[in-house]
């Protein structure tokens, strides 16, 4: 995880610490680098990256995705709605990142780094969103049963699930990064 700097708060309300944006930006780019490394191993190990049968596995997944209504795109941008969506989406991705932990051989540490860095990113963003409405956290029981269900899939579906999680998480972070740069 890239080291965070001491925040430099200024007195007036809503005035942001001068270093908070840099920390968020660097954190997302660090996670994206980690995802690239994991995708490399996944694509080298199987042909999932070229597969056209993604829809079969996608039926089992409810991966967070940016939509127009979330306010994170240039068209219809809404910074507060968008920030809530980013944090909610990252919290929802946590169970999928937990699933990834036993899915890599040579990149085991990288998978752990992506998971831990995402937790840190969530903390940074929650600090930025401190004046916004409460953000709903996924239900731990639902997450536990989802994890069990994913781990019980056959090998092909597990490989496809891994590929889809990484691809979706990458797309989600890229959209988040673009939006957060305006905030």
């Amino acid at each position: 995880v890239p080291p965070g700097e001491d925040s430099k708060d200024v007195a007036a309300p809503h005035r942001q610490p001068l270093t908070s944006s840099e920390r968020i930006d660097k954190q997302i780019r660090y996670i994206l680098d980690g995802i690239s490394a994991l995708r490399k191993e996944t694509c080298n190990k199987s042909n999932m990256c070229e597969s056209s049968k993604e829809a079969l596995a996608e039926n089992n997944l409810n991966l967070p995705k940016m939509a127009e209504k979330d306010g994170c795109f240039q068209s219809g941008f809404n910074e507060e709605t968008c920030l809530v969506k980013i944090i909610t989406g990252l919290l929802e991705f946590e169970v999928y990142l937990e699933y990834l932990q036993n899915r890599f051989e040579s990149s085991e540490e990288q998978a752990r780094a992506v998971q831990m860095s995402t937790k840190v990113l969530i903390q940074f963003l929650q600090k930025k969103a401190k004046n916004l409405d409460a953000i709903t956290t996924p239900d731990p029981t639902t997450n536990a049963s989802l994890l069990t269900k994913l781990q019980a899939q056959n090998q092909w579906l597990q490989d496809m699930t891994t590929h889809l999680i990484l691809r979706s998480f990458k797309e989600f972070l890229q959209s988040s990064l673009r939006a957060l740069r305006q905030m």
Partner: antibody
Framework: EVQLVESGGGLVQPGGSLRLSCAAS????????MHWVRQAPGKGLEWVAK????????YYSDTVTDRFTFSLDTSKSTAYLQMNSLRAEDTAVYYC????????????WGQGTLVTVSS | DIQLTQSPSSLSASVGDRVTITCSAS?????MYWYQQKPGKAPKLLIY???NLASGVPSRFSGSGSGTDFTLTISSLQPEDFATYYC?????????FGQGTKVEIK
């Protein structure tokens, strides 16, 4: 045509106040963060402040913190810089600039408005 | 704050010359930008994120570098390129600018 037009500059005494306006046209104002950058006569560029598209977050340089306030009126596609406790060293041409969507680059700039602080 | 030092501060060149301006940062920066400014005018974005050409900017302009050392190159100087060039960085707020490099006609 995409453009930003600044107004409100002029001569003001030290300790005085001034409000600059930046009117946007030719593009949808709502998704873009806005900035103020200034340039003292014969000198280089100095970043002053940023405001997020909906005005929820603002950032200021140390030289103007607690004296300047950046605000928006999205219904008028206009950004404002309220400058209080002005000093001689605030004398400069003030430019407003739009932040490129998805990047930190400042891609569209106004023509600038001159603020002179002198007794 | 991150300091940016441009070199040279000024240079004289002829139309058709290859011109190189460097920008050195006091510490490693996340993003680097280059601007062109003509007397009495607002700055104009040339290069963003180290090496991406801004919309409408001729391909004779290019940017390179990473970490602390960055370069703006004009492959073949044109009459309209005589101006002052500024590097600008973002690595969190505040944005900072170099002191400028004035490109004059020889």
């Amino acid at each position: 045509e995409v453009q930003l037009v600044e107004s409100g500059g002029g001569l003001v005494q030290p300790g005085g106040s001034l409000r600059l306006s930046c009117a946007a046209s030719g593009f949808t104002f709502s998704p873009f963060a806005m900035h103020w950058v200034r340039q003292a006569p014969g000198k280089g560029l100095e970043w002053v402040a940023k405001i997020s598209p909906g005005g929820s977050w603002t950032y200021y340089s140390d030289t103007v913190t607690d004296r300047f306030t950046f605000s928006l009126d999205t219904s008028k596609s206009t950004a404002y810089l309220q400058m209080n406790s002005l000093r001689a060293e605030d004398t400069a041409v003030y430019y407003c600039a739009r932040q490129k969507w998805g990047y930190y680059a400042l891609d569209i700039w106004g023509q600038g408005t001159l603020v002179t602080v002198s007794s | 704050d991150i300091q940016l030092t441009q070199s040279p501060s000024s240079l004289s060149a002829s139309v058709g010359d290859r011109v190189t301006i460097t920008c050195s940062a006091s510490i490693s920066v996340s993003y680097m930008y280059w601007y062109q400014q003509k007397p009495g005018k607002a700055p104009k974005l040339l290069i963003y994120d180290m090496s991406n050409l801004a919309s409408g900017v001729p391909s004779r302009f290019s940017g390179s570098g990473s970490g602390t050392d960055f370069t703006l190159t004009i492959s073949s100087l044109q009459p309209e390129d005589f101006a002052t060039y500024y590097c600008m960085q973002w690595s969190g707020y505040p944005y900072t600018f170099g002191q400028g490099t004035k490109v004059e006609i020889k």
